[in-house]
C-alpha cells in the first residue's frame, strides 16, 4: 500500500524519495511517473534523471529541489491542482539483477481551508505529522524513503486537520 501525502490546491506538493549513491557521486537513473510502478521503468513519466541531468520533464511544475547529486530525488510539484491527485512512482534504477527500487506514493490534493491563522497549532500539526503535512518549500528537512515512513492513515490526518480547523488553526500544507 502507498504512503499518503496531502497538499492543498495552489500549494506545492512534496513527495520524498532518496537513495545513497555508492560510491558517492556514482549516480543511477531515476524516473518519476504518474501511476503505480510497473514491472519496469515508469509509466506516464513526469521526469527522469540521467547522470547529472534532469530530462523528460513533462511540465515546468515538476522539480527536483533537493540535491539529487547526493541521492535526494524527492519530487516537488508546484501549484498543485485536484488533477494532480493520485499515485506517483519513484523508481531508482540501480543496475544489476532485480536491484531497482520502486516506491509508490499517493498524493491527495485537498481544497484550501478558509480559516484564520494560528501558528502555534500549525507547528503542532507539522510536528505530529512531519513527513505527511509539510510547510517548508522543500518539505521535511529529514529525507526518508517511503518504506521507512511512519504508518499514518488519511483518516487520522483529516481527523486532526478538522479538529484544528474547528479551533481556528490554519492548515497550510505544501
Amino acid at each position: 500500500s502507498e504512503v499518503e501525502y496531502i497538499a492543498e490546491v495552489g500549494q506545492n506538493a512534496y513527495l520524498p524519495c532518496s537513495y545513497t549513491p555508492a560510491p558517492p557521486g556514482n549516480l543511477v537513473p531515476v524516473c518519476w511517473g504518474k501511476g503505480a510502478c510497473p514491472v519496469f521503468d515508469c509509466s506516464n513519466v513526469v521526469l527522469r534523471t540521467e547522470n547529472r541531468d534532469v530530462n523528460d520533464r513533462t511540465s515546468g511544475r515538476y522539480w527536483l529541489k533537493g540535491d539529487f547529486h547526493k541521492g535526494d530525488v524527492s519530487l516537488t510539484i508546484e501549484n498543485v491542482t485536484l488533477a494532480d491527485s493520485g499515485v506517483y512512482c519513484c523508481r531508482i534504477q540501480i543496475p544489476g539483477i532485480m536491484n531497482d527500487e520502486k516506491h509508490n506514493l499517493k498524493l491527495v490534493v485537498i481544497k484550501p481551508a478558509k480559516v484564520t491563522p494560528a501558528p502555534t497549532l500549525q507547528r503542532d500539526l507539522t510536528s505530529a505529522f512531519p513527513r505527511m503535512l509539510t510547510t517548508g518549500e522543500h518539505g521535511p528537512a529529514e529525507t526518508q524513503t517511503p518504506g521507512s515512513l511512519p504508518d499514518v492513515n488519511l483518516t487520522q490526518i483529516f481527523t486532526l486537520t478538522n479538529e484544528l480547523r474547528d479551533s481556528g488553526a490554519t492548515i497550510r500544507t505544501a
Epitope: G35, A36, P38, V39, F40, D41, S43, V45, N99
Partner: antibody
C-alpha cells in the same frame, strides 16, 4: 521493416548449455526493453527474462534464476540468452520480444515477436 | 506473483457471433499494465490490446478490451474465420510478468 529473428536452438542433454540469439532490425534497438518468453509443447506462455535498453537492469523468472543469463549488444542489435544447467522442463519454443520503450509513456505490451527457436532438453 | 485466470478454457462459437473472454487477476492490476495476445498454431503471439483497452497498431476494431482492478475482458464483436485461435492475457504490474493460461476459441 521491424523484425526479430531468433536462432541457436537445438537438442541438448540435461545439464548441458545452449546460447540463443535474437537479431533485431528496423528499429532503434537500444531504445527498447527486450524479453525472452517460452512456450512448452502444448502449454501456455511463460515469461523468462527481460533486460533494459542499456542492459543495466535485468529480471529473471524464479524458474531460471541462476541458470540463465540475458545480455544484449546494442552495437550489433542483438539479444542473447545463455542457458546453463538445462533441465527437461526447459524444453520449449523460445521467443524474443520487443517490450515497452525505455522512454515509453504508458505502453506495456510485447509488440514485436521473433518466430521462435526450439530448445529440446533430453538424454 | 500475480496469477491470471482465464475463462472459459475453451469457447466454441460460429463466425459472426460475439466472443467474450475473461481474465481475472489474483490481485489488483493497474489497467495500464494489462495486455491481450492472439496466437495461432505454429506462430508467435500477436499483441492485440495494451493498457487494458488500447488496440495495438493494425488490430481491427472488432477487438476491444475493458476492465479494471482484477477483472478484465476481451470482446470480439463479430467473429471472422481468422479469429479462431488461442488468446492470452498478460500483466506488467509486478514482477514476474505473468500470462493467463489461455482461452481457446474454436469454430462451433
Amino acid at each position: 521493416q521491424v523484425q526479430l529473428v531468433g536462432s541457436g536452438g537445438g537438442l541438448v542433454k540435461p545439464g548441458g548449455s545452449l546460447r540463443l540469439s535474437c537479431a533485431a532490425s528496423g528499429f532503434t534497438f537500444s531504445d527498447y526493453y527486450m524479453s525472452w518468453i517460452r512456450q512448452a509443447p502444448g502449454k501456455g506462455l511463460e515469461w523468462v527474462s527481460f533486460i533494459s535498453g542499456s542492459g543495466s537492469i535485468i529480471y529473471y523468472a524464479d524458474s531460471v534464476k541462476g541458470r540463465f543469463t540475458i545480455s544484449r549488444d546494442n552495437a550489433k542489435n542483438s539479444l542473447d540468452l545463455q542457458m546453463n544447467s538445462l533441465r527437461a522442463e526447459d524444453t520449449a519454443v523460445y521467443y524474443c520480444a520487443r517490450d515497452g520503450m525505455v522512454r515509453g509513456m504508458n505502453f506495456y505490451g510485447m509488440d514485436v515477436w521473433g518466430q521462435g527457436t526450439t530448445v529440446t532438453v533430453s538424454s | 506473483e500475480i496469477v491470471l485466470t482465464q475463462s472459459p478454457g475453451t469457447l466454441s462459437l460460429s463466425p459472426g457471433e460475439r466472443a467474450t473472454l475473461s481474465c481475472r487477476a489474483s490481485q489488483s492490476v493497474s489497467s495500464s499494465y494489462l495486455a491481450w495476445y492472439q496466437q495461432k498454431p505454429g506462430q508467435a503471439p500477436r499483441l492485440l490490446i495494451y493498457g487494458a483497452s488500447s488496440r495495438a497498431t493494425g488490430i481491427p476494431d472488432r477487438f476491444s478490451g475493458s476492465g479494471s482492478g482484477t477483472d478484465f475482458t476481451l470482446t470480439i464483436s463479430r467473429l471472422e474465420p481468422e479469429d479462431f485461435a488461442v488468446y492470452y492475457c498478460q500483466q506488467y504490474g509486478s514482477s514476474p510478468i505473468t500470462f493467463g493460461q489461455g482461452t481457446r476459441l474454436e469454430i462451433k
